[in-house]
């Protein structure tokens, strides 16, 4: 059965067109419900949109929004279960593995920094001609022989990073995890062992590196190979294209601006609704996003919208003291948040995101890359080709790492430090969803149409 996706008119019509007229307005379906909310909230048939319900599992919006038919069923972000953020970098100060983060924080930081992998035995039969086309490690499509073994870009990159950074992994299970295309990121230990078992050679990585090593210390370290497929310049352009114009930042204190309500929660919801308009336009400007199947684009935006918006307003708030700056130009002070009953989550945003971004002076390119990593979430449920999304995420990792080395060569740990914001972002994003569903359930907070659409989609647990 076809599922209809309700998206901005020009998301469907302009998705492959030029980006000169970014006027998108519309909504996407919501990510999956946090398990702690229990069943029912936001599930179909129980809470209806105030707007007309169209013949679709997703409560629709009517004109001027288009209905995009899709062969996929309802999609949602998978709520993670067993996270791992165990990795070490090549720099001496980060040589020991990080502690695993709690289950709500599994963001799968890259490079292999996310773990995974159980690999099925090859199907029976003569593999001689077949293996040239599939990855010996995970069974994905092979891009050729890498380090002595036919392998995909993902496993090639994972092996290269492991060797170059001299990473060590641990297996949380019995060292016999299945490594396949879908699960290759779950256990880095077993993935690496499989790389070795299949014949990948560490020396081949080192020799490759040595060939490019004789470079004068004042020559620009080339970022082109990492950057050409996922140019950070374009990621920055995407950020700049959708950032609110500074003239919209009125110094409006809560309650003093007659056009804005006193309630900070309402102000935040209105700002989120406004930013959802631009989220599609932003995503379209991220390299390769528009090349994904339309259904997968919908799934990714649906899965990541909350974290994407939180990352943006957190970074925008770097210059604000004890508060956040909304896209509408309004400041929300922590005192207002506390008085509105959302002080705890607000303080988490300030301490785990805003102040950390401020302390390291995270720049807009880095922000854009982190958001692109969130966007390209291969664990989003229902993707037609998770491996393709994972490959894009890995490209962002590589470009971000190259950018950090290029712009901040004094700080070998900066790339890792950036990635370590992702678990907090995931955790805070899930908690914010809980709050949103609660406000929606109670019904005393005005939730505008686009934000409501996010909360109206069917949810599936993983």
């Amino acid at each position: 059965m076809d599922t209809k996706h309700f998206l901005p008119l020009d998301f469907s019509t302009q998705v492959n067109s030029s980006l000169t007229s970014p006027t998108g307005r519309g909504s996407m379906a919501a990510p999956s419900l946090h398990p702690s909310l229990g069943p029912g909230i936001g599930s179909p048939g129980q809470l209806h949109s105030p707007i007309s319900t169209l013949s679709s599992p997703i409560n629709g919006m009517g004109p001027p929004f288009s209905v995009i038919s899709s062969p996929m069923g309802p999609h949602s972000m998978s709520v993670p279960t067993t996270p791992t953020l165990g990795f070490s970098t090549g720099s001496p100060q980060l040589s020991s593995p990080m502690n695993p983060v709690s289950s709500s924080e599994d963001i799968k930081p890259p490079l292999g920094l996310n773990g995974v992998l159980k690999v099925p035995a090859h199907p029976s039969g003569n593999m001689a001609s077949f293996t040239k086309h599939i990855c010996a490690i995970c069974g994905d499509r092979s891009s050729g022989k890498h380090y002595g073994v036919y392998s995909c870009e993902g496993c090639k990159g994972f092996f290269k990073r492991t060797v170059r950074k001299d990473l060590t992994y641990t297996c949380r299970d019995n060292k016999d995890c299945l490594i396949d295309k879908r699960q290759r990121n779950r256990c880095q230990y077993c993935r690496y062992q499989k790389c070795l078992a299949m014949g990948m050679k560490r020396e081949a990585v080192q020799e490759e590196r040595q060939r490019g090593k004789d470079r004068n210390e004042n020559e620009v370290e080339s970022t082109s190979s990492a950057n050409e497929d996922m140019p950070v310049e374009r990621i920055l352009e995407a950020e700049l294209a959708v950032e609110p114009k500074t003239e919209t930042y009125v110094e409006a204190n809560m309650g003093l601006n007659p056009s804005s309500p006193n309630d900070p929660v309402t102000n935040i919801c209105q700002a989120a609704d406004k930013q959802l308009f631009t989220l599609v336009e932003w995503a379209k400007r991220i390299p390769h996003f528009s090349e994904l199947p339309l259904d997968d684009q919908v799934i990714l935006l649906r899965a990541g919208w909350n974290e994407l918006l939180i990352a943006s307003f957190s970074h925008r708030s770097i210059a604000v003291k004890d508060g956040i700056l909304l896209a509408t130009g309004l400041h929300v002070h922590r005192n207002s948040a506390h008085s509105a009953g959302v002080g705890a989550i607000f303080d988490r945003v300030l301490t785990e995101l805003v102040s950390k971004m401020r302390d390291m002076q995270m720049d807009k390119t880095e922000l854009g890359c982190l958001r692109a990593i969130v966007l390209f979430n291969p664990d989003s449920k229902g993707l037609s080709n998770p491996a393709e999304v994972e490959a894009l995420r890995e490209k962002v990792y590589a470009s971000l790492e190259a950018y950090c080395k290029h712009k901040y060569p004094e700080q070998p740990g900066r790339f890792a430090k950036l990635l370590l914001r992702l678990p907090a972002l995931r955790s805070i994003g899930l908690k914010c969803l809980e709050h949103l569903f609660f406000f929606k359930l109670i019904g005393d907070t005005p939730i505008d149409t686009f934000l409501m659409e996010m909360l109206e989609a069917p949810h599936q647990m993983t």
Partner: antibody
Framework: QITLKESGPTLVKPTQTLTLTCTFS??????????VGWIRQPPGKALEWLAL???????RYSPSLKSRLTITKDTSKNQVVLTMTNMDPVDTATYYC???????????WGQGTLVTVSS | PSVLTQPPSASGTPGQRVTISCSGS????????VYWYQQLPGTAPKFLIY???QRPSGVPDRFSGSKSGTSASLAISGLRSEDEADYYC???????????FGGGTKLTVL
């Protein structure tokens, strides 16, 4: 070959604004990875970093002096300008501009210009 | 006071080996690379060591750098009279989002 040269007043009065210009050659501030910084050294004392501007116009300032400093670049003229407001006698120092190395911090320095703050 | 701590002075005779220490914290040396500069009297600082232990071209191999934890050191072997200068260590300071320098060590060749 990379060279940098600082220019500006040698004497400024307290409360006045100091404007220093760094004119450089051998590199372009439009090249990815390039940056120019300012460092000062009071007589007989240690080096102190003031500001840094990157090729992408990103700017960094010493937190203790941030409110008084502004760094700008003119790529076409191969120049970087530092302004420092509300000068005080304790700001008397040799001011250096330096090329930010691709391997980090500063590899090529100007000869420095001594700025004395006195009424 | 400087963020990075160096002994104010050091000395040695020609041919000797001398070591200059630089002590910092987890937010500078502990998490970032260390750089060393040589400043001859009346001149601008010269890039001596980068990324803890790397020498730019033109710097003699008598100069070597090392780092351990939150401390670093510069060793000069086969000391010469022309090595008499002020030596500064430097590192990126995370809390400042900028570089910090040591107080400098005046090396005297006896």
């Amino acid at each position: 070959q990379i060279t940098l040269k600082e220019s500006g007043p040698t004497l400024v009065k307290p409360t006045q604004t100091l404007t220093l210009t760094c004119t450089f050659s051998g590199f372009s501030l439009s090249t990815s990875g390039v940056g120019v910084g300012w460092i000062r050294q009071p007589p007989g004392k240690a080096l102190e970093w003031l500001a840094l501007i990157y090729w992408d116009d990103d700017k960094r300032y010493s937190p203790s002096l941030k409110s008084r400093l502004t760094i700008t670049k003119d790529t076409s003229k191969n120049q970087v300008v530092l302004t420092m407001t509300n000068m005080d006698p304790v700001d008397t120092a040799t001011y250096y501009c330096a090329h930010r190395a691709i391997v980090g911090l500063f590899d090529y320095w100007g000869q420095g210009t001594l700025v004395t703050v006195s009424s | 006071p400087s963020v990075l701590t160096q002994p104010p002075s050091a000395s040695g005779t020609p041919g000797q080996r001398v070591t200059i220490s630089c002590s910092g914290s987890s937010s500078n040396i502990g998490s970032n690379y260390v750089y060393w500069y040589q400043q001859l009297p009346g001149t601008a600082p010269k890039f001596l060591i980068y990324r803890n232990n790397q020498r730019p071209s033109g710097v003699p191999d008598r100069f070597s750098g090392s780092k351990s934890g939150t401390s670093a050191s510069l060793a000069i072997s086969g000391l010469r009279s022309e090595d008499e200068a002020d030596y500064y260590c430097a590192a990126w300071e995370d809390s400042l989002s900028g570089p910090v320098f040591g107080g400098g060590t005046k090396l005297t060749v006896l």
